[in-house]
Interface confidence: medium
């Protein structure tokens, strides 16, 4: 299965910023603006979806204002003239705090999610395909602006409908990548013979050859937590499992379990309250001895995104985080094909699972 390629992100753009939206807006396009509200200067910022760079034709003006208790203005500007404002008297942003702002373009409206929660719907006043530019200005610092093209065969709407009058505000859930150390190594063996992709936010430009079983897909950001899925064929040497997601800002712990029946063959348990990555096996409800050693500092960071790659080899599991090998876990349950269930739970938001 191939996912249509997405535009490359704008990384750490200076504000004020204006950038082209390649191909313009399309139904299903998701645009993520990730940044931090400045704590000092200014009381407003804005994200504009517009035609050209002049600012005279803005299909959607999204304008949080830290004034009068805080509110958000949505509006449209045509030929230099503003229309009637739509105000949301709730402020999901905080000064000095990071945010993750997602705009989903749909046929009738823009749906806006702030830190993973649906915040507002803004119905189109002008045809959205006229939009070819995104601009950001005001009291904000940007980490990135990313673009995710519509995927084929979505299972359900990408944003579940939340009543306008019932906003839910969670702490910010930024997905900005942290600075990486210089290049470590890649790669290993055996082609994946059968791959199932459970995708929420498919990576820009990601492509898969058609697997033997069609991919299961969970549209962004609808991963159910805890997330449980079958590993078709179980584990075997060269089998890899790939997960990516974001640690919640207030996270205490999360876990990734590879299970065999009632046993947990591999329990990977990052603990922020202990600054540790605990590994263990549970057989008949009895835990074995924990393994905690790491070759470097805790790789998971509250509020930041991560990727975990678990590679099964004959004698052990190899685990890499963010492209760097972290540890090996020697098999305690050695009947690999029976290890056929993946369970993920705890204080994370999943964005991609490939089994």
């Amino acid at each position: 299965m191939a996912f249509s390629g997405s535009q490359a992100p704008y990384l750490s753009p200076a504000v004020p910023f204006s950038g082209t939206i390649q191909g313009g807006l399309q139904d299903g396009l998701q645009i993520t603006v990730n940044g931090t509200v400045l704590s000092s200067s200014g009381t407003r910022f804005a994200v504009n979806f517009q035609t050209g760079f002049s600012g005279n034709d803005i299909a959607f003006h999204f304008n949080p204002r830290f004034e009068d208790g805080g509110y958000v203005v949505c509006n449209t500007r045509q030929n230099g003239s503003w229309g009637p404002e739509e105000r949301k008297t709730h402020m999901p942003f905080q000064k000095g705090m990071p945010f993750d702002l997602c705009f989903l373009v749909q046929s009738s409206d823009f749906k806006v999610m702030v830190n993973g929660i649906l915040f507002v719907q803004y119905f189109h006043r002008v045809p959205f395909h006229r939009v070819d530019t995104i601009s950001v200005n005001g009291s904000v610092q940007l980490s990135y602006i990313s673009f995710q093209n519509p995927r084929t065969v979505p299972v359900q709407p990408a944003f579940s409908t939340v009543p306008f009058s019932q906003p839910v505000c969670f702490p910010p859930r930024p997905r900005g990548r942290r600075q990486k150390p210089p290049g470590v190594w890649p790669a290993n063996p055996a082609p994946i013979t059968q791959t199932v992709i459970h995708t929420v936010q498919s990576a820009p430009g990601q492509m898969f050859s058609t697997p033997a079983i069609p991919p299961m897909m969970y549209p962004h950001p609808a991963y159910p937590m805890p997330f449980i899925t079958t590993i078709l064929g179980g584990l075997y040497p060269s089998k890899s499992i790939l997960l990516s997601g974001t640690v919640l800002p207030s996270a205490q712990r999360f876990h990734i379990n590879l299970c065999s029946g009632n046993h947990i063959a591999f329990h990977l348990n990052p603990r922020f309250d202990e600054n540790a990555v605990v590994r263990n096996t549970q057989i008949d409800n009895s835990w074995g001895s924990e393994e905690r050693s790491l070759p470097r500092k805790m790789p998971f960071v509250r509020g930041q995104s991560f990727s975990v790659w678990i590679l099964c080899e004959a004698h052990c599991l190899k685990v890499a985080v963010d492209g760097q090998h972290l540890f090996e876990y020697y098999h305690r349950l050695r009947n690999l094909p029976t290890i056929n269930r993946l369970e993920v739970g705890g204080d994370i938001q999943l964005t991609h699972v490939q089994t």
């Epitope: 290049g183 890649p186 790669a187 055996a190 492509m207 492209g323």
Partner: antibody, heavy 119, light 107 residues
């Protein structure tokens, strides 16, 4: 099916520049390392550079450091090797190859593109 | 840089022969060694990784082993399609290096 296709090779004068492309398909591009390996005519293999698109890691052989730049465009599933200040000894077939997991095992290779540096 | 010294540089053998190629790393590389086969005008193909793990789809007559910093590729019974050049590679550090290659020719 995993495929890597190189392009951009050709004849260039010493001191000149060339940009090679490696178009990838059949896998989740951003989660795999992509490497460039070269082979001078009648010689052995020499690893040149590698990149991990998801994290932006890059790594270079000492022989090309400062002259070559590896990059990746995840929107196009393509890796690039920008080669500047080319020398006669850079003449080779350049292969791009996919790394798997986080080790330097190169499990899929392209067909190669020939770069000739000559006046 | 870690050097990989491969020997012999070439060898002549007959179909059915047992062939052994060795590589010595200039320092410890753990088991982070792979072996590749390359035929003229073609890209290399992965045979062995992690010193001794057989890559998917590679015939079982190929095997790899490790003894300290010495690594060995063995072809238990040489077949006509095995005449090629073989390379070892270490990937222990952030920079990979290959051995010089061993050309296996028909006797």
């Amino acid at each position: 099916e995993v495929q890597l296709v190189e392009s951009g090779g050709g004849l260039v004068q010493p001191g000149g520049s060339l940009r090679l492309s490696c178009a990838a398909s059949g896998f989740t591009f951003r989660y795999y390392y992509i490497h460039w390996v070269r082979q001078a005519p009648g010689k052995g293999l020499e690893w040149v550079a590698g990149i991990y698109p998801y994290g932006g890691y890059t790594s270079y052989a000492d022989s090309v450091k400062g002259r070559f730049t590896i990059s990746a465009d995840t929107s196009k599933n393509t890796a690039y090797l920008q080669m500047n200040s080319l020398r006669a000894e850079d003449t080779a077939v350049y292969y791009c190859a996919r790394g798997y997991y986080v080790e330097g095992v190169l499990d899929y290779w392209g067909q190669g593109t020939l770069v000739t540096v000559s006046s | 840089d870690i050097q990989m010294t491969q020997s012999p540089s070439s060898l002549s053998a007959s179909v059915g022969d047992r062939v052994t190629i060795t590589c010595r790393a200039s320092q410890s590389v753990s088991s982070a060694v792979a072996w590749y086969q390359q035929k003229p005008g073609k890209a290399p193909k992965l045979l062995i990784y992690s010193a001794s793990s057989l890559y998917s789809g590679v015939p079982s007559r190929f095997s790899g082993s490790r003894s300290g910093t010495d690594f060995t590729l063995t072809i238990s019974s040489l077949q006509p399609e095995d005449f090629a050049t073989y390379y070892c590679q270490q990937y222990y550090g952030s920079l990979a290096t290959f051995g010089q290659g061993t050309k296996v020719e028909i006797k």
